[in-house]
C-alpha cells in the first residue's frame, strides 16, 4: 500500500539500528572515497529527519522519495567534484536519472588500501569503548570496497563480527580466539560479495527475466516438494528483493527480504520440511539461514521428465501459448530432479530446450525433430562433470597454492594482455574452489565448483570491462552469463600475443620479502610466475616448475642468511641468469 512518507514507513519497519546501518551502507557504496566521519554525519542527519517524519508524516519534505532525499544529501557534500570528478555531474540530473547516474559510477575496484585488521588488543579496546562506532567502521569499510554487497547480508556479517568480538575480547588470549573466527567471517563475506555481484550483473545486463530464471532453478533444487506456483511466487519476490538491492534501494530491499523470510516461515508446509531451524532464529540470522538452507528430500515418485516435455503431443501448442511459463515449468521440473547440477548448467539445458522448440515447432513434424532433445543434453552435462573431475584431481595432487599456480599459468596463457595483479587475484580466487568444493560429497561438487567459478569470472569480466585489453576475454565476457565459464575453459594459448621482453627488475627481490606474511609472499611469487609466462607463453610446465623451485630455494636461502641484503644482491642476479637459461 502507498504511504504518505516513505522514509517514515521504512524507519518504522526496520527499526533505528538497521535503518542507520542500511543508510550508512548506501552512502558508502555510492561515495566510496568519503571518510567514515563524513558518512556518519549524513546518516545521523537522515535518521533525525526520518524521526521527524515518523512523528508527523505531513512535515516538510517527508513525502519525497528516498532517492530524492538520499541524492540531495549526497549532492550537498562539499568538494564533490574535487574528490569524485564526473560523478558530480550526476547532481545536475533529476530523479530517476540521478540515481541511475550514481549507480553507473560505482567502482568495482576502488583504489583503496586493503582493509587491514588491527591487532587484537587495539581492536578490543576500540570495540569496548564504542561498539556502535566500531561496527559503523566495519560497515563503511566493507561497503565502500564492495559497492554491490547485499546490504541486509552485510548487516548479518556485522552482527557476526560483533558476537565474535564480544566473546573473544573477554578471553585471555584474544588473538588466537579472534583470528580464526574473523578469518572465517571474512572468507564467507568475500564469497557473498562475488556471488551478489554476479546477481547484479545478471540483472543489469540481461534484466529481471534472466535473474528470475536463475532463481527458479535455484529454488526448485532447494525446495523440490514445493509446486510450480509456489516456486514462481518465491522467485518473483526474490527477484524484487535483489533488483532493489542492486539498484541501491537498500531500505526497500531489506524490508522486502524480511517480508519474504516471514512468508517462508509461515508457509513451511508448502515449501520445505527443512526450514524450522532457520525460522526459530532472529531476523538477520533467519534470512541468512534460509538463503543457504539444505535441500529438502526429493519426492520419490517423480515421473520421467520426458512425459510432459517430449512425449506429450501438445508440447508445441503449450509452448506457443505461454513460452516463458512452459520453459519455466521445464526449468522447475528439471531442477528439482537435479540438485547435483549447477544452476549455470540447468540454465544452459533450458536454453538448449528452448532453442530446440523454437526450431522444431516451426517444422512440419515437430515430435520427430525434438524427440532426441534430452539425449542432446548429454555433452552439455559431461563437460562440467569432466571439468570438476580434472580440477579436483589436480587440486588434490598440488594443494591450494600449487593449484592456484597451475590456474595462473593457464589463465595467463589464455589472456596474457590482462594486468598481472588482475590475473593473480583471479587465479588465487579460482584456486580456492578446490578447498571450498573438492572436499564436498560427490553430488555437491558440480554445483559448488561451477557456480563459484562463474561468480569469480564475472569479476574478471567487470575488471576487464574497465580497460579491455584481451580479445579472448572480451569474447567470453560479451556472451550470456551462463556460457562464460565454458567459454573461458575452452580458451587456449593466445597466439596473437607478442611475448613481453625480459626485464631483470621484474624478477629482482629484496630482503623485505622475508618479513611479509605468508599470503603476501605467495602473491609476490605468483606475480613473478605470471610475468614469466608473459615472457615465455609457451614455456612447458616442467620449465616453469624448475624456475619456481629455484626461486623458492633462493628466497629460503637468503631469508635464512645472516646478511640478507648481501645475499639478495649477489644471489639475485644469478637467479635471473639461471631463469633466462632455463626458459631459453
Amino acid at each position: 500500500e502507498a504511504h504518505k512518507s516513505e522514509i517514515a514507513h521504512r524507519y518504522n519497519d526496520l527499526g533505528e539500528q538497521h535503518f542507520k546501518g542500511l543508510v550508512l551502507i548506501a552512502f558508502s557504496q555510492y561515495l566510496q572515497k568519503c571518510s567514515y566521519d563524513e558518512h556518519a554525519k549524513l546518516v545521523q542527519e537522515v535518521t533525525d529527519f526520518a524521526k521527524t517524519c515518523v512523528a508527523d508524516e505531513s512535515a516538510a519534505n517527508c513525502d519525497k522519495s528516498l532517492h530524492t532525499l538520499f541524492g540531495d544529501k549526497l549532492c550537498a557534500i562539499p568538494n564533490l567534484r574535487e574528490n569524485y570528478g564526473e560523478l558530480a555531474d550526476c547532481c545536475t540530473k533529476q530523479e530517476p536519472e540521478r540515481n541511475e547516474c550514481f549507480l553507473q559510477h560505482k567502482d568495482d575496484n576502488p583504489s583503496l588500501p586493503p582493509f587491514e585488521r588491527p591487532e587484537a588488543e587495539a581492536m578490543c579496546t576500540s570495540f569496548k569503548e564504542n561498539p556502535t562506532t566500531f561496527m559503523g567502521h566495519y560497515l563503511h569499510e566493507v561497503a565502500r570496497r564492495h559497492p554491490y554487497f547485499y546490504a541486509p547480508e552485510l548487516l548479518y556479517y556485522a552482527e557476526q563480527y560483533n558476537e565474535i568480538l564480544t566473546q573473544c575480547c573477554a578471553e585471555a588470549d584474544k588473538e588466537s580466539c579472534l583470528t580464526p573466527k574473523l578469518d572465517g567471517v571474512k572468507e564467507k563475506a568475500l564469497v557473498s560479495s562475488v556471488r551478489q555481484r554476479m546477481k547484479c550483473s545478471s540483472m543489469q545486463k540481461f534484466g529481471e527475466r534472466a535473474f528470475k530464471a536463475w532463481a527458479v532453478a535455484r529454488l526448485s533444487q532447494t525446495f523440490p516438494n514445493a509446486d510450480f506456483a509456489e516456486i514462481t511466487k518465491l522467485a518473483t519476490d526474490l527477484t524484487k528483493v535483489n533488483k532493489e538491492c542492486c539498484h541501491g534501494d537498500l531500505l526497500e530491499c531489506a524490508d522486502d527480504r524480511a517480508e519474504l523470510a516471514k512468508y517462508m516461515c509461515e508457509n513451511q508446509a508448502t515449501i520445505s520440511s527443512k526450514l524450522q531451524t532457520c525460522c526459530d532464529k532472529p531476523l538477520l540470522k533467519k534470512a541468512h539461514c534460509l538463503s543457504e538452507v539444505e535441500h529438502d528430500t526429493m519426492p520419490a515418485d517423480l515421473p520421467a521428465i520426458a512425459a510432459d516435455f517430449v512425449e506429450d503431443q501438445e508440447v508445441c501448442k503449450n509452448y506457443a501459448e505461454a513460452k516463458d511459463v512452459f520453459l519455466g515449468t521445464f526449468l522447475y521440473e528439471y531442477s528439482r530432479r537435479h540438485p547435483d547440477y549447477s544452476v549455470s548448467l540447468l540454465l544452459r539445458l533450458a536454453k538448449k530446450y528452448e532453442a530446440t522448440l523454437e526450431k522444431c515447432c516451426a517444422e512440419a513434424n515437430p515430435p520427430a525433430c525434438y524427440g532426441t532433445v534430452l539425449a542432446e543434453f548429454q555433452p552439455l552435462v559431461e563437460e562440467p562433470k569432466n571439468l570438476v573431475k580434472t580440477n579436483c584431481d589436480l587440486y588434490e595432487k598440488l594443494g591450494e597454492y600449487g593449484f592456484q599456480n597451475a590456474i595462473l599459468v593457464r589463465y595467463t596463457q589464455k589472456a596474457p594482455q590482462v594486468s598481472t595483479p588482475t590475473l593473480v587475484e583471479a587465479a588465487r580466487n579460482l584456486g580456492r574452489v578446490g578447498t571450498k568444493c573438492c572436499t564436498l560429497p560427490e553430488d555437491q561438487r558440480l554445483p559448488c565448483v561451477e557456480d563459484y567459478l562463474s561468480a569469480i569470472l564475472n569479476r574478471v569480466c567487470l575488471l576487464h570491462e574497465k580497460t579491455p585489453v584481451s580479445e579472448h576475454v572480451t569474447k567470453c565476457c560479451s556472451g550470456s552469463l551462463v556460457e562464460r565459464r565454458p567459454c573461458f575453459s575452452a580458451l587456449t594459448v593466445d597466439e596473437t600475443y607478442v611475448p613481453k621482453e625480459f626485464k631483470a627488475e621484474t624478477f629482482t627481490f629484496h630482503s623485505d620479502i622475508c618479513t611479509l606474511p605468508e599470503k603476501e609472499k605467495q602473491i609476490k611469487k605468483q606475480t613473478a610466475l605470471a610475468e614469466l609466462v608473459k615472457h615465455k607463453p609457451k614455456a612447458t610446465a616442467e620449465q616453469l616448475k624448475t624456475v619456481m623451485d629455484d626461486f623458492a630455494q633462493f628466497l629460503d636461502t637468503c631469508c635464512k642468511a645472516a646478511d640478507k641484503d648481501t645475499c639478495f644482491s649477489t644471489e639475485g642476479p644469478n637467479l635471473v641468469t639461471r631463469c633466462k637459461d632455463a626458459l631459453a
Epitope: 503449450n318 506457443a320 505461454a322 523454437e358
Partner: nanobody, 123 residues
Framework: QVQLQESGGGLVQPGGSLRLSCAAS????????MVWVRQATGKGLEWVST????????RYADSVNGRFTISRDNAENTLYLLMNSLKPEDTAVYYC????????????????RGQGTQVTVSS
C-alpha cells in the same frame, strides 16, 4: 486491464467462409501467444488453434486443420481466424484467449477471454 474483443461472426451457409478478428489491449500482445477456442451450446470449451508471439509456431485442432487459418498483426494488436469450408458442426461461440498468469497451460476456462462472437453454419 486485459481486454479482448471478438468480431466477424454471423450466419453462413455450409461451405462458406468467415473471417474473425480479435482486438487486444491492456497487455503485451506482441510477446503473448494467442488462442482461438469455441463453445457449442451445451458443450465445454474446445480448443481450435494457437499462434505463438512471433507467428512462427501455429497449431490447429484436427477438426479444423486444412480449413482454418490463424494469423496476427502485432503492429495492430489484432488476432485473426480465417474459416473456410465451414460445416454445421463449426457452429459455436468463438473466443480469442490468452494465457493468464497462475493458470495451467491449456486450461482455457482460466485464460483471459473476450465476450465471444457467434458463428452459425446452416442452410
Amino acid at each position: 486491464q486485459v481486454q479482448l474483443q471478438e468480431s466477424g461472426g454471423g450466419l453462413v451457409q455450409p461451405g462458406g467462409s468467415l473471417r474473425l478478428s480479435c482486438a487486444a489491449s491492456g497487455f503485451a500482445f506482441s510477446t503473448s501467444g494467442m488462442v482461438w477456442v469455441r463453445q457449442a451450446t451445451g458443450k465445454g470449451l474446445e480448443w481450435v488453434s494457437t499462434i505463438s508471439d512471433d507467428s512462427r509456431i501455429i497449431r490447429y485442432a484436427d477438426s479444423v486443420n486444412g480449413r482454418f487459418t490463424i494469423s496476427r498483426d502485432n503492429a495492430e494488436n489484432t488476432l485473426y481466424l480465417l474459416m473456410n469450408s465451414l460445416k454445421p458442426e463449426d457452429t459455436a461461440v468463438y473466443y480469442c484467449a490468452t494465457y493468464r498468469a497462475g493458470s495451467r497451460i491449456g486450461s482455457y476456462e482460466d485464460y483471459y477471454r473476450g465476450q465471444g462472437t457467434q458463428v452459425t453454419v446452416s442452410s
